[in-house]
Interface confidence: low
């Protein structure tokens, strides 16, 4: 009696279970009663990443430099090419089809994590005792100046955007 279901890595065709092609290979002809499934390797610019019965391999993704993209990892017969963005840019989505500039951290924020080709700058608010007075993609929050260590006193309190202002101690005789 013909099977109604096949084992893992097989497929049902003409009332018969045939082996799927392994990753990196495409289907040339289905198996018969007398022959095995015939598969052929994908060419250099192509891939298939699963056990399959595809008659065509997929083209590797093209990382178009005109779009700010560059190759992060070259594709193989079993994996697609992975693109990333050029310096100063990062991907808008996981599939990395387009790039946008890294954002800066505004005054009052410092860089928690510098951007990469695939992720944007992560900013964090400067906590009490720290400040940032610049819009920067690299600078962390800086600690307020310690007036005491310079034998000075605080004349103006610091904020998340400004440093403290130190001044001489009033020496009243």
């Amino acid at each position: 009696e013909p099977p109604t279901a096949c084992r893992e890595k097989q497929y049902l065709i003409n009332s018969q279970c045939c082996s799927l092609c392994q990753p990196g290979q495409k289907l040339v002809s289905d198996c018969t009663e007398f022959t095995e499934t015939e598969c052929l390797p994908c060419s250099e610019s192509e891939f298939l990443d699963t056990w399959n019965r595809e008659t065509r391999c997929h083209q590797h993704k093209y990382c178009d430099p005109n779009l700010g993209l560059q190759v992060q990892q070259k594709g193989t017969s079993e994996t697609d090419t992975i693109c990333t963005c050029e310096e100063g840019l990062h991907c808008t989505s996981e599939s990395c089809e387009s790039c946008v500039p890294h954002r800066s951290c505004l005054p009052g924020f410092g860089v928690k994590q510098i951007a990469t080709g695939v992720s944007d700058t992560i900013c964090e608010p400067c906590p009490v005792g720290f400040f940032s007075n610049v819009s920067s993609a690299f600078e962390k929050c800086r600690p307020w100046t310690s007036c005491e260590t310079k034998d000075l006193v605080v004349q103006q309190a610091g904020t998340n955007k400004t440093d403290v202002v130190c001044g001489p101690q009033d020496r009243q005789r």
Epitope: L67, S98, C123
Partner: antibody, heavy 118, light 107 residues
Framework: EVQLQESGPGLVKPSQTLSLTCTVS????????WNWIRKHPGKKLEYMGF???????YYTPSLKSRITISRDTSKNQFSLKLSSVTAADTAVYFC????????????WGQGTLVTVSS | DIQMTQSPSAMSASVGDRVTITCRAS??????LSWIQQKPGGTIKRLIN???TLASGVPSRFSGSRSGTEFTLTISSLQPEDFADYYC?????????FGGGTKLEIK
Amino acid sequence: EVQLQESGPGLVKPSQTLSLTCTVSGDSVSSGYWNWIRKHPGKKLEYMGFISYSGSTYYTPSLKSRITISRDTSKNQFSLKLSSVTAADTAVYFCARFRRYDDGVDYWGQGTLVTVSS
Amino acid sequence: DIQMTQSPSAMSASVGDRVTITCRASHEISGYLSWIQQKPGGTIKRLINAASTLASGVPSRFSGSRSGTEFTLTISSLQPEDFADYYCLQYSSYPWTFGGGTKLEIK
């Protein structure tokens, strides 16, 4: 002074393709990021996507299967195509410029109403 | 997507009043928020960018501030030309998202 001007048909039939063009003066579409945003009847504003100085595009996930943004650098224009439209695509469509994070979206077109109706 | 919750959705006020509109972001947006104004004619004008920077040509009665993920637009003394719709826009991450809008009407 940077100016953006939307143009295109004001009435589109359901299932057809909506096509709009934004003509830019005072700046080049070969620099910055050029965006489409729409305002539905009522108050809801929706971001649609951009085409960048390099020609790369970003489409909001909910529209990705229907939207195409392209540009014509010789005419200094960028365009929106939205396929298989329904009444839910009736909106005022705006084009807008984005250059720097510190500046946000700094120039907007005046908007054009597109009605989807048979 | 980042959700922007704007309140109130509508309010009425008189010329000279001080008015405050707020937007809350569902995630940290690092200050990348704009306030925009839409007049009845339909034209959109940017008022504030980067949470608190006044856009060029915008009167100083408009100001923006931020506390954590809550952002505020304040109009210190309402003028007749200020009656319009106001929206916040986060442009920190894609897709950009807008608040639901505030309709500011004359009392």
